[in-house]
């Protein structure tokens, strides 16, 4: 956030940039949390825009019995590996076809025993406040589907009648990692020393990191004709003086008519 300065007072302004603001020859360049000619004002909303999508990664192991292991399978640029990868990916795309969050598989390692396939199942969902539940449900369905296919697609009389056959006992889920996104924590961190006064409110399932000085939210402070300003002790209303009135009170709701004061009478609205 920047405020441009013109004229003789500019040199003076340069030395007075506050809150870590830096002078660029024309104006104070303010850090994220501040704005104003001297970076003296605290912003009332901070962009903590969530990522568009949240990902999860499941580390799985399955044992493929319909392919003979060779040392070439360890070499990811070999024809053996490339063909195995193509078929394994095709097979897994079929297995997980009913899971909207499913993105694909990534083979990390192939080892002996027929072919033990260490791989990641990649999941992704659009960000909503319920993303954890959505991804938790998806990981459960992945477990169910891989358990089912490795139980059903097995060699019978040394014949595999499917794209791939598996060893039922070789299926394991090692680890599940979900990208963490905590808007409340992000909001607190980005608000730094004002963290106690910034809160997260949702609109259309999108989180907004706001202070009570941001209008239009349930926590918004009504300063009436005054101006809401954030300080280290919290949000405060700075009351205005008009041609006819002085305003005071915590929310600038008390108006005193100047003419009455000059006439030694007080009148409150």
């Amino acid at each position: 956030r920047t405020t441009t300065c013109f004229g003789d007072g500019c040199q003076n302004t340069a030395s007075r940039c506050k809150n870590g603001g830096t002078w660029d020859g024309l104006k104070c360049q303010c850090p994220n949390l501040y704005y104003g000619e001297l970076c003296e004002e605290v912003v009332s909303s901070i962009d903590i825009g969530p990522p568009e999508t949240i990902s999860a990664q499941m580390e799985l192991t399955v044992t493929v019995t319909s392919v003979k292991f060779t040392e070439e399978l360890k070499n990811h640029s070999s024809q053996e590996f490339q063909e195995f990868k193509q078929t394994f990916t095709e097979q897994m795309n079929i297995v997980y076809s009913g899971i909207p969050e499913y993105v694909g598989v990534n083979i990390t390692k192939l080892r002996l025993g027929s072919v033990v396939v260490e791989h990641d199942v990649l999941l992704r969902t659009k960000y909503t406040p319920e993303y954890k539940t959505v991804l938790d449900n998806a990981t459960e369905v992945v477990k169910e589907k891989i358990t089912k296919v490795t139980t059903q697609q097995i060699m019978i009389n040394d014949i595999c009648s499917d794209m791939m056959c598996f060893n039922t006992t070789g299926t394991q889920v090692q680890n599940i990692t979900v990208t963490q996104y905590d808007p409340e924590e992000d909001c607190r961190k980005m608000a730094k020393e004002y963290g106690d006064y910034f809160v997260v409110e949702y609109r259309d399932q999108k989180p907004y990191c706001i202070s009570p000085c941001e209008p239009g939210f349930s926590v918004s402070k009504n300063c009436n004709l005054g101006k809401c300003q954030m300080s280290l002790s919290g949000p405060q209303c700075l009351c205005v003086t008009t041609e006819t009135h002085w305003y005071s009170g915590e929310t600038c709701n008390q108006g005193t008519q100047k003419s009455l004061v000059y006439g030694h009478h007080h009148h409150h609205h």
């Epitope: 053996e80 078929t87 040394d158």
Partner: nanobody, 124 residues
Framework: EVQLVESGGGLVQPGRSLRLSCAAS???????MGWFRQAPGKEREGVAG???????GYADSVKGRFTISRDNAKNSLYLQMNSLRAEDTALYSC???????????????????RGQGTMVTVSS
């Protein structure tokens, strides 16, 4: 990448024989090989399959009439078709599995490489 080219198709009378060949551009030694066919307006079906060690499998409709064989030295696959019937009319294509595939038979999903096919028409 394995390229497969079929030959030997043509017009033949019912009860006669035909031999199809499939030439592979690469080594087929460690691959299951198979023949498929697709009749006009119908789905593709597996006809016959052969494992790298010569174990064969056939669709019920061709058992006793068709014989699949391979010559690894020549990187070739064959299908000997005897006692041909009108219902054998189809586009015949050969296919190769991924390397080191075991437990093969004639089903289509075991194969990742397929040829363009050769047309067999059985008609009097």
């Amino acid at each position: 990448e394995v390229q497969l080219v079929e030959s030997g198709g043509g017009l033949v009378q019912p009860g006669r024989s035909l031999r199809l060949s499939c030439a592979a551009s690469g080594d087929i030694t460690r691959r299951c090989m198979g023949w498929f066919r697709q009749a006009p307006g119908k789905e593709r079906e597996g006809v016959a399959g052969i494992s790298e060690d010569g174990i064969t499998g056939y669709a019920d409709s061709v058992k006793g009439r068709f014989t699949i064989s391979r010559d690894n030295a020549k990187n070739s696959l064959y299908l000997q078709m005897n006692s041909l019937r009108a219902e054998d009319t189809a586009l015949y294509s050969c296919a190769a599995s991924i390397l080191n595939r075991v437990g093969c038979r004639q089903l289509s999903y075991e194969y990742i490489y397929r040829g363009q096919g050769t047309m067999v028409t059985v008609s009097s």
